[in-house]
Interface confidence: medium
Protein backbone atom coordinates (compact mmCIF):
# COMPACT_ATOMS: atom_id res chain seq x y z
CA UNK A 1 0.00 0.00 0.00
CA UNK A 2 1.35 3.42 -0.98
CA UNK A 3 1.90 5.99 1.75
CA UNK A 4 2.31 9.73 1.16
CA UNK A 5 2.94 12.48 3.70
CA UNK A 6 0.05 14.57 4.92
CA UNK A 7 -1.11 17.07 2.25
CA UNK A 8 0.44 14.94 -0.52
CA UNK A 9 -1.56 12.94 -3.07
CA UNK A 10 -0.56 9.46 -4.22
CA UNK A 11 -0.72 8.37 -7.86
CA UNK A 12 1.09 5.45 -9.53
CA UNK A 13 3.80 4.97 -6.89
CA UNK A 14 4.54 8.69 -6.62
CA UNK A 15 3.47 11.40 -4.19
CA UNK A 16 2.47 14.84 -5.43
CA UNK A 17 2.14 18.14 -3.59
CA UNK A 18 -0.05 20.86 -5.12
CA UNK A 19 0.75 24.29 -3.70
CA UNK A 20 -1.80 26.87 -2.63
CA UNK A 21 0.43 29.91 -2.97
CA UNK A 22 2.74 31.07 -5.76
CA UNK A 23 6.50 31.37 -6.24
CA UNK A 24 8.93 31.78 -9.11
CA UNK A 25 10.30 28.59 -10.65
CA UNK A 26 13.55 28.50 -8.68
CA UNK A 27 11.84 29.24 -5.36
CA UNK A 28 9.29 26.54 -6.13
CA UNK A 29 12.11 24.03 -6.60
CA UNK A 30 13.69 25.31 -3.37
CA UNK A 31 10.47 24.48 -1.57
CA UNK A 32 10.26 21.01 -3.11
CA UNK A 33 13.89 20.35 -2.22
CA UNK A 34 13.15 21.26 1.40
CA UNK A 35 10.54 18.49 1.34
CA UNK A 36 13.01 15.92 -0.10
CA UNK A 37 11.24 16.22 -3.43
CA UNK A 38 11.61 17.98 -6.79
CA UNK A 39 9.33 19.94 -9.04
CA UNK A 40 7.16 17.32 -10.67
CA UNK A 41 8.60 15.04 -13.29
CA UNK A 42 5.82 13.82 -15.60
CA UNK A 43 6.57 10.33 -16.92
CA UNK A 44 3.39 9.24 -18.70
CA UNK A 45 0.21 10.52 -20.31
CA UNK A 46 -1.74 9.03 -17.42
CA UNK A 47 0.35 11.04 -14.98
CA UNK A 48 -0.07 14.20 -17.06
CA UNK A 49 -3.84 13.73 -17.19
CA UNK A 50 -3.96 13.13 -13.44
CA UNK A 51 -1.99 16.34 -12.76
CA UNK A 52 -4.11 18.39 -15.17
CA UNK A 53 -7.28 17.07 -13.58
CA UNK A 54 -6.16 17.46 -9.98
CA UNK A 55 -4.50 20.89 -10.14
CA UNK A 56 -7.64 22.72 -11.28
CA UNK A 57 -7.58 25.79 -13.54
CA UNK A 58 -4.45 27.47 -12.11
CA UNK A 59 -1.03 27.34 -13.77
CA UNK A 60 1.47 25.12 -11.89
CA UNK A 61 5.24 24.93 -12.39
CA UNK A 62 6.72 21.49 -13.13
CA UNK A 63 10.35 20.37 -13.14
CA UNK A 64 11.25 21.06 -16.77
CA UNK A 65 13.64 23.81 -17.79
CA UNK A 66 15.98 24.63 -20.64
CA UNK A 67 18.82 26.92 -21.49
CA UNK A 68 18.67 29.06 -24.61
CA UNK A 69 18.97 26.83 -27.67
CA UNK A 70 19.21 23.68 -25.56
CA UNK A 71 16.76 20.79 -25.08
CA UNK A 72 14.31 20.62 -22.21
CA UNK A 73 15.62 18.77 -19.15
CA UNK A 74 14.07 17.51 -15.95
CA UNK A 75 15.45 18.56 -12.56
CA UNK A 76 17.48 15.34 -12.35
CA UNK A 77 19.25 16.22 -15.61
CA UNK A 78 17.53 13.70 -17.87
CA UNK A 79 16.37 15.02 -21.24
CA UNK A 80 12.68 15.43 -21.91
CA UNK A 81 11.46 12.84 -24.43
CA UNK A 82 8.69 14.95 -25.93
CA UNK A 83 5.84 13.07 -24.29
CA UNK A 84 3.61 16.12 -24.73
CA UNK A 85 3.89 19.51 -26.44
CA UNK A 86 5.23 22.53 -24.54
CA UNK A 87 4.05 25.86 -25.92
CA UNK A 88 5.77 29.23 -25.52
CA UNK A 89 9.32 30.51 -25.59
CA UNK A 90 10.11 30.58 -21.87
CA UNK A 91 12.85 28.61 -20.12
CA UNK A 92 10.64 26.92 -17.50
CA UNK A 93 7.58 24.74 -18.02
CA UNK A 94 4.22 24.83 -16.30
CA UNK A 95 0.88 23.09 -16.64
CA UNK A 96 -2.11 25.22 -17.60
CA UNK A 97 -5.73 24.29 -18.26
CA UNK A 98 -4.93 22.79 -21.66
CA UNK A 99 -1.55 21.10 -21.21
CA UNK A 100 1.99 22.42 -20.88
CA UNK A 101 3.41 25.83 -21.68
CA UNK A 102 6.53 27.80 -20.72
CA UNK A 103 7.41 31.13 -19.15
CA UNK A 104 10.30 33.10 -17.71
CA UNK A 105 11.75 31.70 -14.48
CA UNK A 106 10.98 34.79 -12.39
CA UNK A 107 7.22 34.78 -12.99
CA UNK A 108 5.10 33.56 -10.09
CA UNK A 109 2.86 30.50 -10.30
CA UNK A 110 1.61 27.67 -8.16
CA UNK A 111 3.72 24.53 -8.36
CA UNK A 112 3.67 20.74 -8.08
CA UNK A 113 6.32 18.71 -6.22
CA UNK A 114 6.79 14.99 -6.70
CA UNK A 115 8.70 12.20 -4.99
CA UNK A 116 8.58 8.43 -4.79
CA UNK A 117 6.02 7.08 -2.38
CA UNK A 118 6.83 4.90 0.62
CA UNK A 119 5.52 1.36 0.47
CA UNK A 120 4.34 0.00 3.79
Amino acid sequence: QAACPESWIGFQRKCFYFSDDTKNWTSSQRFCDSQDADLAQVESFQELNFLLRYKGPSDHWIGLSREQGQPWKWINGTEWTRQFPILGAGECAYLNDKGASSARHYTERKWICSKSDIHV
Partner: antibody
Framework: QVQLVQSGGGLVKPGGSLRLSCAAS????????MSWVRQAPGKGLEWVGR??????????DYAAPVKGRFTISRDDSKNTLYLQMNSLKTEDTAVYYC???????WGQGTLVTVSS | ETTLTQSPGTLSLSPGERATLSCRAS???????LAWYQQKPGQAPRLLIY???TRATGIPDRFSGSGSGTDFTLSISRLEPEDFAVYYC???????????FGQGTRLEIK
Protein backbone atom coordinates in the same frame (compact mmCIF):
# COMPACT_ATOMS: atom_id res chain seq x y z
CA GLN B 1 9.85 45.75 -11.11
CA VAL B 2 11.28 44.08 -8.03
CA GLN B 3 12.79 46.42 -5.44
CA LEU B 4 14.34 45.81 -2.02
CA VAL B 5 15.00 49.07 -0.18
CA GLN B 6 17.03 48.86 3.02
CA SER B 7 17.26 51.16 6.02
CA GLY B 8 18.46 51.20 9.61
CA GLY B 9 22.24 50.94 9.49
CA GLY B 10 24.64 53.09 11.47
CA LEU B 11 27.26 53.24 14.21
CA VAL B 12 26.70 51.26 17.40
CA LYS B 13 28.89 50.40 20.39
CA PRO B 14 29.93 46.79 21.17
CA GLY B 15 27.17 45.08 23.10
CA GLY B 16 24.56 47.36 21.55
CA SER B 17 21.56 46.60 19.36
CA LEU B 18 20.34 47.68 15.94
CA ARG B 19 17.40 46.77 13.70
CA LEU B 20 17.66 46.72 9.92
CA SER B 21 14.61 46.92 7.64
CA CYS B 22 14.09 45.82 4.06
CA ALA B 23 10.98 47.08 2.25
CA ALA B 24 9.97 44.87 -0.67
CA SER B 25 7.89 45.62 -3.75
CA UNK B 26 7.25 44.18 -7.20
CA UNK B 27 6.65 40.59 -6.10
CA UNK B 28 4.46 38.59 -3.73
CA UNK B 29 6.47 39.19 -0.57
CA UNK B 30 4.27 37.04 1.66
CA UNK B 31 5.10 33.95 -0.44
CA UNK B 32 8.84 34.59 -0.59
CA UNK B 33 11.59 33.11 1.55
CA MET B 34 14.02 35.91 2.40
CA SER B 35 17.68 36.00 3.46
CA TRP B 36 20.29 38.34 4.87
CA VAL B 37 23.90 38.32 3.61
CA ARG B 38 26.75 40.50 4.92
CA GLN B 39 30.12 41.67 3.70
CA ALA B 40 32.84 42.91 6.04
CA PRO B 41 34.97 45.78 4.67
CA GLY B 42 37.29 44.48 1.96
CA LYS B 43 36.11 40.88 2.51
CA GLY B 44 33.86 38.37 0.81
CA LEU B 45 30.16 37.57 1.17
CA GLU B 46 28.80 35.72 4.22
CA TRP B 47 25.32 34.27 4.66
CA VAL B 48 23.62 35.48 7.87
CA GLY B 49 20.25 33.73 7.91
CA ARG B 50 16.87 33.26 6.29
CA UNK B 51 13.16 33.15 7.04
CA UNK B 52 10.59 31.07 5.19
CA UNK B 53 7.16 32.33 4.22
CA UNK B 54 4.44 31.90 6.83
CA UNK B 55 2.62 29.39 4.63
CA UNK B 56 5.82 27.34 4.52
CA UNK B 57 6.14 27.45 8.29
CA UNK B 58 7.79 30.83 8.82
CA UNK B 59 10.83 29.16 10.35
CA UNK B 60 14.24 30.80 10.59
CA ASP B 61 17.79 29.50 10.14
CA TYR B 62 21.00 31.29 11.15
CA ALA B 63 24.71 31.09 10.51
CA ALA B 64 26.71 29.92 13.55
CA PRO B 65 28.45 33.29 14.24
CA VAL B 66 25.11 35.11 14.74
CA LYS B 67 22.89 32.39 16.19
CA GLY B 68 21.33 33.49 19.47
CA ARG B 69 22.19 37.16 18.86
CA PHE B 70 20.39 37.98 15.61
CA THR B 71 16.68 37.52 14.87
CA ILE B 72 15.04 37.64 11.46
CA SER B 73 11.36 38.50 11.26
CA ARG B 74 8.85 39.69 8.70
CA ASP B 75 5.68 41.77 8.53
CA ASP B 76 3.79 40.61 5.47
CA SER B 77 1.17 43.35 5.90
CA LYS B 78 3.97 45.90 5.39
CA ASN B 79 5.98 43.85 2.88
CA THR B 80 8.97 44.31 5.15
CA LEU B 81 11.80 42.07 6.34
CA TYR B 82 13.72 42.79 9.56
CA LEU B 83 17.06 41.87 11.07
CA GLN B 84 17.27 42.52 14.81
CA MET B 85 20.91 42.48 15.91
CA ASN B 86 21.70 42.25 19.64
CA SER B 87 24.97 41.86 21.60
CA LEU B 88 26.84 43.30 18.65
CA LYS B 89 30.56 42.65 18.28
CA THR B 90 33.22 44.53 16.35
CA GLU B 91 33.40 41.59 13.94
CA ASP B 92 29.75 42.22 12.97
CA THR B 93 30.88 45.39 11.19
CA ALA B 94 29.77 44.90 7.59
CA VAL B 95 27.46 45.95 4.80
CA TYR B 96 24.25 43.95 5.25
CA TYR B 97 22.15 42.95 2.23
CA CYS B 98 18.62 41.59 2.17
CA UNK B 99 17.88 39.21 -0.66
CA UNK B 100 15.20 36.88 -1.88
CA UNK B 101 16.16 33.35 -0.87
CA UNK B 102 16.93 32.20 -4.40
CA UNK B 103 19.24 35.26 -4.55
CA UNK B 104 17.77 36.78 -7.72
CA UNK B 105 17.16 40.16 -6.11
CA TRP B 106 19.27 42.14 -3.63
CA GLY B 107 18.82 45.29 -1.60
CA GLN B 108 21.27 48.15 -1.97
CA GLY B 109 23.03 47.27 1.28
CA THR B 110 23.33 49.15 4.55
CA LEU B 111 26.51 49.66 6.58
CA VAL B 112 26.62 48.59 10.22
CA THR B 113 29.68 49.77 12.14
CA VAL B 114 30.32 48.34 15.61
CA SER B 115 32.98 50.40 17.35
CA SER B 116 33.64 51.97 20.71
CA GLU C 1 29.91 22.05 5.59
CA THR C 2 30.81 22.56 1.93
CA THR C 3 33.57 25.05 1.17
CA LEU C 4 34.05 26.70 -2.21
CA THR C 5 37.54 27.60 -3.42
CA GLN C 6 37.90 30.02 -6.31
CA SER C 7 40.93 30.34 -8.54
CA PRO C 8 42.83 32.32 -9.47
CA GLY C 9 42.58 34.91 -6.69
CA THR C 10 43.36 37.64 -9.22
CA LEU C 11 43.17 37.47 -13.00
CA SER C 12 44.81 40.16 -15.14
CA LEU C 13 43.54 40.33 -18.70
CA SER C 14 42.94 42.85 -21.46
CA PRO C 15 39.60 43.84 -23.02
CA GLY C 16 38.68 41.45 -25.82
CA GLU C 17 40.37 38.47 -24.17
CA ARG C 18 38.61 35.41 -22.75
CA ALA C 19 38.37 34.95 -18.98
CA THR C 20 38.00 31.57 -17.28
CA LEU C 21 37.22 31.53 -13.56
CA SER C 22 37.16 28.33 -11.52
CA CYS C 23 35.12 27.32 -8.47
CA ARG C 24 35.87 24.03 -6.73
CA ALA C 25 33.62 22.53 -4.03
CA SER C 26 35.00 20.45 -1.16
CA UNK C 27 32.28 17.88 -1.85
CA UNK C 28 29.87 17.20 -4.69
CA UNK C 29 27.01 19.69 -4.84
CA UNK C 30 23.80 20.02 -6.83
CA UNK C 31 24.32 22.19 -9.90
CA UNK C 32 20.74 23.39 -9.37
CA UNK C 33 22.04 25.60 -6.56
CA LEU C 34 25.36 26.85 -7.93
CA ALA C 35 25.39 30.54 -8.84
CA TRP C 36 27.87 33.19 -9.99
CA TYR C 37 27.83 36.90 -9.08
CA GLN C 38 29.60 40.02 -10.22
CA GLN C 39 30.32 42.77 -7.72
CA LYS C 40 31.69 46.23 -8.36
CA PRO C 41 32.93 48.60 -5.63
CA GLY C 42 30.10 50.11 -3.60
CA GLN C 43 27.45 47.98 -5.29
CA ALA C 44 25.40 44.95 -4.31
CA PRO C 45 26.29 41.63 -5.97
CA ARG C 46 24.63 41.07 -9.33
CA LEU C 47 23.43 37.58 -10.22
CA LEU C 48 25.00 36.38 -13.48
CA ILE C 49 24.41 32.63 -13.58
CA TYR C 50 22.16 30.31 -11.60
CA UNK C 51 21.70 26.56 -11.85
CA UNK C 52 25.41 26.42 -12.82
CA UNK C 53 24.71 27.36 -16.42
CA THR C 54 21.56 29.47 -16.81
CA ARG C 55 22.07 33.17 -17.44
CA ALA C 56 20.01 35.49 -15.27
CA THR C 57 17.70 38.03 -16.88
CA GLY C 58 19.54 40.74 -18.82
CA ILE C 59 22.97 39.09 -18.64
CA PRO C 60 24.87 39.26 -21.98
CA ASP C 61 25.57 35.98 -23.73
CA ARG C 62 29.34 36.50 -23.42
CA PHE C 63 28.88 35.15 -19.88
CA SER C 64 28.48 31.39 -19.59
CA GLY C 65 28.62 28.86 -16.78
CA SER C 66 29.40 25.17 -16.84
CA GLY C 67 30.37 22.28 -14.61
CA SER C 68 28.93 19.70 -12.25
CA GLY C 69 29.82 17.79 -9.13
CA THR C 70 32.77 19.61 -7.60
CA ASP C 71 34.13 21.68 -10.50
CA PHE C 72 32.40 24.72 -11.95
CA THR C 73 33.54 27.39 -14.38
CA LEU C 74 32.47 30.90 -15.31
CA SER C 75 33.63 32.02 -18.74
CA ILE C 76 33.53 35.49 -20.27
CA SER C 77 34.15 35.13 -23.99
CA ARG C 78 35.23 38.67 -24.91
CA LEU C 79 35.99 40.97 -22.02
CA GLU C 80 34.36 44.39 -22.08
CA PRO C 81 35.68 47.28 -19.92
CA GLU C 82 32.63 46.98 -17.63
CA ASP C 83 33.41 43.32 -16.87
CA PHE C 84 36.37 44.11 -14.64
CA ALA C 85 35.10 43.42 -11.13
CA VAL C 86 35.09 40.76 -8.40
CA TYR C 87 33.31 37.47 -9.15
CA TYR C 88 31.89 35.11 -6.53
CA CYS C 89 30.56 31.60 -6.83
CA UNK C 90 27.87 30.51 -4.40
CA UNK C 91 26.29 27.25 -3.32
CA UNK C 92 22.89 27.42 -1.67
CA UNK C 93 20.64 24.66 -0.45
CA UNK C 94 18.41 23.32 2.27
CA UNK C 95 20.53 20.63 3.92
CA UNK C 96 22.04 22.32 5.78
CA UNK C 97 20.12 25.52 5.11
CA UNK C 98 22.02 28.58 4.03
CA UNK C 99 24.55 29.62 1.46
CA UNK C 100 28.29 29.33 1.03
CA PHE C 101 30.31 31.77 -1.05
CA GLY C 102 33.73 31.38 -2.58
CA GLN C 103 36.36 33.90 -1.54
CA GLY C 104 36.12 35.70 -4.88
CA THR C 105 38.23 36.23 -8.00
CA ARG C 106 39.32 39.77 -8.81
CA LEU C 107 39.32 40.38 -12.57
CA GLU C 108 41.54 43.37 -13.31
CA ILE C 109 42.69 45.16 -16.44
CA LYS C 110 46.18 44.17 -17.54
Amino acid sequence: QVQLVQSGGGLVKPGGSLRLSCAASGFTFSNAWMSWVRQAPGKGLEWVGRIKSKTDGGTTDYAAPVKGRFTISRDDSKNTLYLQMNSLKTEDTAVYYCTTDEYFYWGQGTLVTVSS
Amino acid sequence: ETTLTQSPGTLSLSPGERATLSCRASQSISSTYLAWYQQKPGQAPRLLIYGASTRATGIPDRFSGSGSGTDFTLSISRLEPEDFAVYYCQQYGNSPPGATFGQGTRLEIK
